[in-house]
């Protein structure tokens, strides 16, 4: 602890100018004071001034008032500092002396004489309020005040509490009258060393090193550090914890950068076709009749199906076609003839047969010729009869398929290593695929090798359209529609002028 006992001398009266021994001072009592402060004693005794002592210079002669200011080199109030916890009790001895010598340092002068003394014993609490008193004896009167205050940075009832205001990283505070800390704005904690972060700053995910700050811990962002940072590279995703990438609807992959809903996001299918998603960035366009291409962007020629008969030439029109008929023919498709056998309409040695009582005719063509007037030479390779990349070659009235290595059969349809062993039972047709032979079974049989006889015939309900052939046997109770030229789909329900690569499995 640390404090100061302060004594303010206010007025001293010695009207007769007398000493304690009854003698008078000549020419007057030149008065100074000695003060002794010590621990409380019920009976004041001589001995060391345990709490301190002080002397004044000469303050006046006989009777005088002491002003609240420095008097010579002395001070009023007088200061008696102590470096211990104030006990709350004390004993005080104030002596008035006459000196014939030095005004400033009368203590050192010989021949000093006692004028009077007073003794005060009691209790005194620390505080700013002065306690005023007056002591009389037969010759003198002394008016004075005293108090105990704490030294700078000491607080509390006994000046035992040390507190120094500070504003550094070990504390940001001022001191209350009782010595407790009063945090500066923006700081908290026992020592006011903890900053108060920006209001709303997330308790776990954010922190601060000075007030009204919010510094985010790794994985968090935003003004209040309450937004997680998704995985680096996350494109179409969010997070609920740091480094996560939870994909938005329609997106997939580690970085949510794979489009699972390509149809909706990009609308790739044209001309009213139907789009079906099929995995990341995958889709299939199902074209309306009359369109083809990956995106159904190509309009099929209305003449693609060769609708004009009897050598009529076909012209595309906006939504249809028009047949220009050769001489002797008429009708939408040039299907009606104005010719008769008399007009020798059959070419290349074709035989003419009259029909409808001579109003029309039919030509019977010799080998290698076809057409309603035997006008076309048969090219047996136009139907692309050779499978698995086989090369078609015309050989007079017939044609042959020249197969690639590893394939055989009239149409190169057999993989030598797989179908050569005739693995399909009950007349099943063998198809060579990358993963081995697959059997297309006739009605009434199923199983990988058509070995299972089935009672329920999946083809019985006639599921295949447009004259397609129905097979069972790829797996139990399934059926296969083998589409004719110009149709595709699981039931051969879509007309497209392209050959199917393999039968569709329903």
């Amino acid at each position: 602890g640390s404090g100061i006992f302060q004594l303010r001398l206010q007025e001293f009266v010695n009207q007769r100018g007398m000493l304690a021994n009854g003698q008078s001072c000549e020419p007057g009592c030149r008065t100074f004071f000695r003060i002794c402060l010590k621990h409380f004693q019920a009976t004041f005794s001589e001995g060391p001034c345990t709490f301190g002592n002080v002397s004044t210079p000469v303050l006046g002669t006989n009777s005088f008032v002491v002003r609240d200011k420095n008097s010579g080199s002395g001070r009023n109030p007088l200061q008696l500092p102590f470096n211990f916890t104030w006990p709350g009790t004390f004993s005080l001895n104030i002596q008035a002396w006459h000196t014939p010598g030095d005004d400033l340092r009368p203590e050192t002068s010989p021949g000093n004489s006692l004028i009077s003394q007073i003794i005060i014993q009691g209790s005194l609490a620390v505080g700013k309020i002065w306690r005023t008193d007056e002591q009389n004896d037969t010759l003198t009167r002394l008016s004075y005040s005293y108090r105990v205050i704490c030294s700078d940075n000491y607080y509390g009832e006994s000046c035992s509490r040390l507190c120094k205001k500070r504003d550094d990283h070990f504390g940001h505070y001022e001191c209350q009258p009782d010595g407790s800390l009063s945090c500066l704005p923006g700081w908290t904690g026992k020592y006011c060393d903890q900053p108060i972060c920006l209001s709303g700053c997330h308790e776990q995910n954010g922190y601060c090193s000075k007030p009204d700050e919010c510094i985010c811990r790794p994985g968090w962002q935003g003004r209040l550090c309450n937004e997680c940072i998704p995985h680096n590279g996350c494109r179409h995703g969010t997070c609920s914890i740091p480094w996560q990438c939870a994909c938005d609807e329609g997106w997939g992959g580690l970085f949510c950068d794979q489009d699972l809903n390509y149809c909706t996001h990009h609308s790739p299918c044209k001309n009213g076709s139907t789009c079906s998603n099929s995995g990341p960035k995958g889709y299939t366009c199902t074209c309306l009749p009359g369109y083809t291409g990956e995106h159904c962007e190509l309009g099929l020629s209305k003449c693609a199906s060769n609708p004009c008969r009897n050598g009529g030439s076909c012209k595309d029109q906006e939504n249809s076609y028009h047949c220009l008929c050769p001489p002797g023919y008429y009708g939408q498709h040039c299907e009606h003839s104005t010719l008769t056998c008399a007009d020798s309409p059959c070419f290349n040695g074709g035989s003419c047969r009259e029909r409808n009582q001579g109003s029309s005719y039919a030509c019977e063509c010799p080998p290698n010729f076809t057409g309603s007037n035997c006008e076309k030479k048969v090219d047996r390779c136009t139907s692309n009869p050779c499978a698995n990349g086989g090369q078609c070659q015309n050989r007079g009235p017939s044609r042959t398929c020249r197969c690639r290595p590893g394939f055989t059969g009239t149409h190169c349809e057999l993989h030598i290593s797989d179908c050569a062993r005739s693995p399909c039972a009950h007349g099943g047709t063998c198809h060579d695929l990358e993963n081995g032979p697959v059997c297309t079974c006739p009605a009434g049989f199923s199983g990988r090798r058509c070995e299972v006889r089935i009672t329920h015939d999946a083809c019985a309900s006639g599921p295949c359209f447009n004259g397609a052939t129905c097979y069972t046997g790829l797996s139990p109770n399934n059926f296969v529609c083998n589409c004719p030229y110009g149709f595709v789909g699981s039931r051969c329900e879509f007309p497209v002028g392209l050959p199917p690569s393999f039968p569709w499995v329903a």
């Epitope: 040390l162 120094k164 500070r166 903890q194 090193s209």
Partner: antibody, heavy 121, light 104 residues
Framework: EVQLQESGPGLVKPSETLSLTCTVS??????????WGWIRQPPGKGLEWIGD???????YYNPSLKSRVTISVDTSKNQFSLKLSSVTAADTAVYYC??????FGGGADSWGQGTLVTVSS | SYELTQPPSVSVSPGQTASITCSGD??????VSWYQQKPGQSPVLVIY???TRPSGIPERFSGSNSGDTATLTISGTQPMDEADYYC?????????FGSGTKVT
């Protein structure tokens, strides 16, 4: 009881960077009650405060060394580190790491045993 | 920059009182710590916040601080107290050590 241990090369060439690490055991470096400081003492001379760091990463440096000093903390390893760049022979000293207690008004109540770093080519 | 000044040396007889001063502008308004360092050893905190002893420090060590001067007092000095003593204070956000006093 907390213990501090300095580690790093004992010899550094002039103009290079001095790097030291202090490993704290027996206590958490993430405690809000302490700062973690570096103090050095040239041979036969007095102590010089270099700087300190809080577990959040807030740093405070001696103004005379500030342009060359970097102190960092790795709470996962319970370590803090000192880097002093562009060293000269005047940086030759015993380097101490210490724990400065908020409750002791900043007094350093625990010290490492010190490591001598010599700057010489 | 802030400076703390200490006498280079203080001599004392065993059993007597040694007083080491540390002066700096307005030092009484700052908290002062005192460290003891023996040859070849790390410093040890003996006084913090002007006058408080950490646990394990003998009662013969005491401190005071007012005005521009802080004082470390060793009452009944023992031979084992022979060491260098450093005062330290904080100036704003920076730590400052005194120049050190050798007590023999």
């Amino acid at each position: 009881e907390v213990q501090l241990q300095e580690s790093g090369p004992g010899l550094v060439k002039p103009s290079e960077t001095l790097s030291l690490t202090c490993t704290v055991s027996g206590g958490s470096i993430s405690s809000s009650n302490y700062y973690w400081g570096w103090i050095r003492q040239p041979p036969g001379k007095g102590l010089e405060w270099i700087g300190d760091i809080y577990y959040t990463g807030s740093t405070y440096y001696n103004p005379s060394l500030k342009s060359r000093v970097t102190i960092s903390v790795d709470t996962s390893k319970n370590q803090f580190s000192l880097k002093l760049s562009s060293v000269t022979a005047a940086d030759t000293a015993v380097y101490y790491c210490a724990r400065e207690a908020v409750s002791f008004g900043g007094g350093a109540d625990s010290w490492g045993q010190g490591t001598l770093v010599t700057v010489s080519s | 920059s802030y400076e703390l000044t200490q006498p280079p040396s203080v001599s004392v007889s065993p059993g007597q009182t040694a007083s080491i001063t540390c002066s700096g502008d307005g030092l009484g308004d700052k908290y002062v710590s005192w460290y003891q360092q023996k040859p070849g050893q790390s410093p040890v905190l003996v006084i913090y916040e002007d006058s408080t002893r950490p646990s394990g420090i003998p009662e013969r060590f005491s401190g005071s601080n007012s005005g521009d001067t802080a004082t470390l007092t060793i009452s009944g000095t023992q031979p084992m107290d022979e060491a260098d003593y450093y005062c330290q204070a904080w100036d704003s956000e920076s730590g400052v050590f005194g120049s050190g006093t050798k007590v023999t």
